[in-house]
């Protein structure tokens, strides 16, 4: 199972639920479905308040129990380490895969943290981060921001991923904007 890591804004916008949490238990494999669940302790929720409704405490995250079907395997044994988890809601349960955005909170740049906390959501409705995988590539719409990190280095480590968000400049036009310049 292979997938290109998304721009964090794309991960935020395409997810039903974005939280900060600690993985606190050994995974349990469901004897019927062969899905596994990790026990988590949620510390912050950045997206999903409406989707969740009253059940605002997420205690488990679910994923296929095998690598071949894109299951997520949590390698850190540090139960006090916080992770940013962006996933999908299925029947009220948080699901992730290998392709989901799951990253140690401490590994995120200050700009990315600000993005998840308040800024990425501004670009979700109008703007689209458009991956440029090979040259030449051109914008297909004024609301697209061309993401070129993959051409230069690992996509999640690139400048646009770590420091920029695709945000509305004016109606019908989105541009890369520095998350540093956003109000903290």
């Amino acid at each position: 199972c292979t997938c290109v890591p998304p721009h964090p804004q794309t991960a935020f916008c395409n997810s039903d639920l974005v939280i900060r949490a600690k993985f606190v238990g050994t995974p349990e494999v469901n004897q019927t479905t062969l899905y596994q669940r990790y026990e988590i302790k949620m510390t912050k929720m950045y997206k999903g308040f409406q989707a969740l409704g009253d059940a605002a405490d997420i205690r488990f995250v679910y994923t296929p129990a095998m690598e071949s079907v894109c299951g997520y395997f949590h390698r850190s044994h540090n139960r006090s380490e916080e992770f940013l988890i962006a996933g999908k809601l299925q029947d009220g349960l948080l699901h992730i895969t290998t392709c989901s955005f799951v990253a140690p909170w401490n590994s995120l740049s200050l700009a990315q943290r600000r993005g998840f906390t308040k800024t990425y959501t501004v670009g979700c409705e109008e703007c689209t981060v458009f991956p440029c995988l090979s040259i030449p590539c051109k914008l297909q719409s004024g609301t697209h921001c061309l993401w070129t990190d993959q051409l230069l280095q690992g996509s999640e480590k690139g400048f646009q991923s770590r420091h920029l968000a695709c945000l509305p400049r004016e109606p019908g036009l989105c541009t890369w904007q520095s998350l540093r310049s956003q109000i903290a």
């Epitope: 995974p27 494999v29 004897q31 019927t32 479905t33 062969l34 095998m66 390698r75």
Partner: antibody, heavy 113, light 111 residues
Framework: QVQLVESGGGLVQPGGSLRLSCAAS????????MSWVRQAPGKGLEWVSA????????YYADSVKGRFTISRDNSKNTLYLQMNSLRAEDTAVYYC??????WGQGTLVTVSS | DIALTQPASVSGSPGQSITISCTGT?????????VSWYQQHPGKAPKLMIY???NRPSGVSNRFSGSKSGNTASLTISGLQAEDEADYYC??????????FGGGTKLTVLG
């Protein structure tokens, strides 16, 4: 108590086909993922294939992928393994197993010309 | 492919205790609490002795116990008896391949 009884083994020529069955009793069959495990003569154990409780998800060892098909009929409490394009190295006792615990007594499959 | 490492053989005298180790990785033994141990007498099907690291099915003697530390699981047999002589296999859930097995350990009861 949990009982798993395999059948369908026998002698088959290389390139031939065979269908193994496993009749389950003593537990709610549809609530458990099931798998097939095999043991070649004088050798260790090798996982072959697995299937979720509903039958919606199936998994295979690389050595049998594309040749073997696992399936189940929950109304009959029966697990199946359809084995095609059999090779000499598929010769083994085949066991059906519930999730990660109980196994049957096994059925011998011999692939030889 | 043998994914879990077991000693090829162990031996002990009647009444003694022996321990069989089973070493894997963080994606199998170390990552899950789904280690099982099976006893196999010649010409017979494997019999479940321990499941979920340390649980005994009903009917299995309390002389058999299981444990785990890091990526290594262990089966301990206390008060060794002649009928314990058999092959012992460990099995673990594995994130990469579903189920993995040890190569088996031949237990010899001396005397």
């Amino acid at each position: 108590q949990v009982q798993l009884v395999e059948s369908g083994g026998g002698l088959v020529q290389p390139g031939g086909s065979l269908r193994l069955s496993c009749a389950a009793s003593g537990f709610t069959f549809s609530s458990y993922a099931m798998s097939w495990v095999r043991q070649a003569p004088g050798k260790g154990l090798e996982w072959v294939s697995a299937i979720s409780g509903s039958g919606g998800s199936t998994y295979y060892a690389d050595s049998v992928k594309g040749r073997f098909t696992i399936s189940r009929d929950n109304s009959k409490n029966t697990l199946y393994l359809q084995m095609n394009s059999l090779r000499a190295e598929d010769t083994a006792v085949y066991y059906c197993a519930r999730f990660f615990d109980y196994w049957g007594q096994g059925t011998l499959v011999t692939v030889s010309s | 492919d043998i994914a879990l490492t077991q000693p090829a053989s162990v031996s002990g005298s009647p009444g003694q205790s022996i321990t069989i180790s089973c070493t894997g990785t963080s994606s199998d033994v170390g990552g899950y609490n789904y280690v099982s141990w099976y006893q196999q007498h010649p010409g017979k099907a494997p019999k479940l002795m321990i499941y979920d690291v340390s649980n005994r099915p009903s009917g299995v003697s309390n002389r058999f116990s299981g444990s785990k530390s890091g990526n290594t699981a262990s089966l301990t047999i206390s008060g060794l008896q002649a009928e314990d002589e058999a092959d012992y296999y460990c099995q673990s859930y594995d994130f990469k391949t579903y189920l993995v097995f040890g190569g088996g350990t031949k237990l010899t009861v001396l005397g």
